[in-house]
């Protein structure tokens, strides 16, 4: 039994780091491996992933952190039975893969405006909680073509935009995703997506109802 | 062996500043999120706020906001608080404690005393 | 605030014999990773704070196993089975889950 590809991990920066790998042939990971990781640190215990199949020959592993500091450094032990496969180390915070944010809602009730929430995905005591920065998706369900990306930099988890940028009388999807530059981390998983049915009164109708009114005067 | 130890006692009149130190051994802080507890005279423990040495990152209880700041020194394996506008309620002890993911850890304390 | 409420606050027990302290949470100290960080601390006279109980049921390394914890949610216990006189000073239990942390008021045990 042998390692085809070596371990590689991701970290949320709070408390799950996901490692990945293959084996040389089909494998029951939960029966045949275990992965051991400590922290390097006073008091640090070993702790024991029980590793689950990601396809015939995958295994993935979900490594429980209580905390995560910027310095952190885990050493990696791969076991099957009483032979060691391989031995390795992560840095959570050179391999941070955020959070996705949750809770978007878009609120339809402010005149003309499109008003896009969604919760921060981090406590106020993580690092990453005023670091993030997100991307929503828009996307029409009638046209394919009609799909846009906004991009928001600032802090606030919220998004608004003018109903009239999207159109009228159909119904639209959005979702979101976080990625954090001071860690330069890859992008979350979209967040679930959300539906409403955008409904507007088009400045042409309106236009056309005003100059119609003033033909009558 | 592991130990932290702080700045000795200090006395300062109502309105001015009082910066204490507390320097790490046997550890690195960059390891750990380094926090400060306050305890006045005969009174229980309050938690005052707390850095991760290696980004700087800060976070206060809400009661000392403003007038509290937690720094460190990763060069000296150093924790400094600072509080400013004293008062007479600030005499206490201060604890700086390292904690990873808990008060394993706690300095001696430092007396300040506010008094005019 | 997360406010923790301790009971008793002074405790007066016969060497060799059982004590309990109570602590109850405000709202819910479970964290979003999953982790209650509820901690026990004794303080003893004339010196800093040292750690009992982490993440509820955890002994610190060193410490004797006469004291344990339990609870859940918003309701938390330490227990000594039997007292010993090395055992007086003030305990302090402690929510690390929700900034702003907090202490308990603590409560105070002496020996009989």
């Known amino acids: 039994m042998k390692v085809l590809q070596e371990p590689t991990c991701v970290s949320d920066y709070m408390s799950i780091s996901t490692c990945e790998w293959k084996m040389n042939g089909p494998t029951n990971c939960s029966t045949e491996l275990r992965l051991l990781y400590q922290l390097v640190f006073l008091l640090s215990e070993a702790h024991t992933c029980i590793p689950e199949n990601n396809g015939g020959a995958g295994c993935v592993c979900h490594l429980l952190m209580d905390d995560v500091v910027s310095a952190d450094n885990y050493t990696l032990d791969l076991w099957a039975g009483q032979q060691l496969l391989w031995k390795g180390s992560f840095k959570p915070s050179e391999h941070v893969k955020p959070r996705a944010p949750g809770n978007l809602t878009v609120h339809t009730n402010v005149s003309d405006t499109l008003l896009l929430t969604w919760s921060n995905p981090y406590p106020p005591d993580n690092y990453l909680y005023n670091h993030l920065t997100y991307a929503v998706n828009i996307w029409s369900e009638n046209d394919p073509a009609d799909f846009r990306i906004y991009n928001v930099t600032y802090l606030e988890p919220s998004l608004r935009i003018a109903a009239s940028t999207l159109k009228s009388g159909i119904s639209y999807r959005a979702r979101v995703r976080a990625w954090a530059q001071c860690y330069n981390t890859t992008w979350s998983e979209w967040s679930p997506s959300t539906k409403w049915h955008n409904s507007y009164r088009e400045p042409f109708e309106q236009h056309h109802h005003h100059h119609h009114h003033h033909h009558h005067h | 062996e592991v130990q932290l130890v702080q700045s000795g006692a200090e006395v300062k009149k109502p309105g001015a500043t009082v910066k204490i130190s507390c320097k790490a051994s046997?550890?690195?802080?960059?390891?750990?999120?380094m926090h400060w507890v306050k305890q006045a005279p005969g009174k229980g423990l309050e938690w005052v706020g707390r850095i991760d040495p290696t980004n700087g990152y800060t976070i206060y209880a809400s009661k000392f906001q403003g007038r509290v700041t937690i720094t460190a020194d990763t060069s000296t394996n150093t924790a400094y608080m600072e509080l400013s506008s004293l008062r007479s309620e600030d005499t206490a002890v201060y604890h700086c404690?390292?904690?990873?993911?808990?008060?394993?850890?706690w300095g001696q304390g430092t007396l300040v005393t506010v008094s005019s | 605030d997360i406010v923790m409420t301790q009971t008793p606050l002074s405790l007066s027990v016969t060497p060799g014999q059982p004590a309990s302290i109570s602590c109850r949470s405000s709202?819910?100290?479970?964290?979003?990773?999953?982790?209650?960080?509820l901690e026990w601390y004794l303080q003893k006279p004339g010196q800093s704070p040292q750690l009992l109980i982490y993440?509820?049921?955890n002994r610190f390394s060193g410490v004797p196993d006469r004291f344990s914890g339990s609870g859940s949610g918003t309701d938390f216990t330490l227990k000594i089975s039997r007292v010993e006189a090395e055992d007086v000073g003030v305990y302090y239990c402690f929510q690390g889950s929700h900034v702003p942390y907090t202490f308990g008021q603590g409560t105070k045990l002496e020996i009989k």
């Open positions: 046997g550890f690195n802080i960059k390891d750990t999120y």
């Open positions: 993440k509820v049921t």
């Open positions: 404690v390292s904690r990873r993911p808990w008060f394993a850890y």
């Open positions: 709202q819910s100290i479970v964290h979003s990773n999953g982790n209650t960080y």
